[in-house]
């Protein structure tokens, strides 16, 4: 049957967990993807962000993942609205960005 | 105050069981990650295993010589680590530390353990 | 399994500056952790993340990293740092921790 929200959200949280822990060299050979408003946008922007960056294996099970939670397809550039004053940041800090506002979404109890 | 304090530690026989406890207390204890590292006598410091918080899925590493005897567990409702130990032998003779990174990895980064209890010490002989 | 490794023993005089090295493979992609154990006592988290110093630790003691080494200097050491000294990083996986054998540092008072 279908993963209950909250189950895929921890095994979310894990994956991004595992993609941080004690990690210094660059995430993605220091790529750099759009800021986005997480509290706006949720997990499409998020995907929308990731979209543009390729050939990194560290991320491709995070970029599955969050595909599971965006209803529809998302191409690339799709929510440009919704990023933060065009600004750029590296993916190792959009990740540690995303993993703290899922922390607190499941904290908050909205996936339960 | 920040503080960790373990217990349970104590003379076995060889083929027995121990487990050892952690109370925590001064930080948020669901958030950390927990570690436990022992000292042989007269020996350095050797990493025994972690669990990470419950929000970070909760699971636990083992160092090769202690897996599958080990368990590290916890019960955040009492801010308390466990160290369950099985199958003793001479070599686990040591004093058992818990350790803590007690903020960093809430946040995605992992500080090094930055506060640790006195030690408990055990002693495995026939 | 993976090792850290750290030389058994420095001695300087007082004022003179420490340097404890310690080599591992996942170096160059995990951070190493230094910590300070004094006869008898529970360790002390001295470096973080490479060369980060944690309120409350001198500034004498800094760290620093390069390929598979990492260092722990302390610049004018003094008798009340002499001490065992540790490295601790993960593997490459990040799951498994690991410290070094251990640096007695002497001050030569």
């Known amino acids: 049957g279908p993963v209950p929200p909250s189950t895929a959200l921890r095994e979310l949280i894990e994956e991004l967990v595992n993609i941080t822990q004690n990690q210094k060299a660059p995430l993605c050979n220091g790529s750099m993807v759009w800021s986005i408003n997480l509290t706006a946008g949720g997990f499409c922007v998020a995907l929308d962000s990731l979209t543009n960056v390729s050939g990194c294996s560290a991320i491709e099970k995070t970029q599955r993942m969050l595909s599971g939670f965006c209803p529809h397809k998302v191409s690339a550039g799709q929510f440009s609205s919704l990023h933060v004053r065009d600004t750029k940041i590296e993916v190792a800090q959009f990740v540690k960005d995303l993993l703290l506002h899922l922390k607190k979404l499941f904290r908050e109890g909205q996936f339960n | 105050e920040v503080q960790l304090v373990e217990s349970g530690g104590g003379l076995v026989k060889p083929g027995g069981s121990l487990r050892l406890s952690c109370a925590a207390s001064?930080?948020?204890?669901?958030?950390?990650?927990m570690s436990w590292v022992r000292q042989a006598p007269g020996k350095g410091l050797e990493w025994v295993g972690r669990i990470r918080s419950e929000i970070d899925g909760g699971t636990t590493n083992y160092a090769a010589p202690v897996k599958g005897r080990f368990t590290i567990s916890r019960d955040d409702s009492k801010n308390t680590l466990y160290l369950q130990m099985n199958s003793l032998k001479t070599e686990d003779t040591a004093v058992y530390y818990c350790?803590?990174?007690?903020?960093?990895?809430?946040?995605?980064?992992?500080?090094?353990?930055?506060?640790w209890g006195q030690g408990t010490t055990v002693t495995v002989s026939s | 399994s993976y090792e850290l490794t750290q030389p058994p023993s420095v001695s300087v005089s007082p004022g003179q500056t420490a340097r404890i090295t310690c080599s591992g493979d996942?170096?160059?992609?995990?951070?190493a952790y230094w910590y300070q154990q004094k006869s008898g006592q529970a360790p002390v988290l001295v470096i973080y993340?490479?060369?980060k110093r944690p309120s409350g630790i001198p500034e004498r003691f800094s760290g620093s990293s390069s390929g598979t080494m990492a260092t722990l200097t302390i610049s004018g050491a003094q008798v009340e740092d002499e001490a065992d000294y540790y490295c601790?990083?993960?593997?490459?996986?990040?799951?498994?921790?690991?410290f070094g054998g251990g640096t007695k540092l002497t001050v030569l008072g």
């Open positions: 350790a803590t990174d007690q903020v960093g990895a809430y946040y995605g980064d992992y500080y090094g353990m930055d506060v």
């Open positions: 001064g930080f948020t204890f669901s958030n950390a990650w």
């Open positions: 996942a170096l160059p992609e995990k951070y």
């Open positions: 993340e490479d060369s």
């Open positions: 601790h990083s993960t593997d490459s996986s990040g799951n498994h921790g690991v």
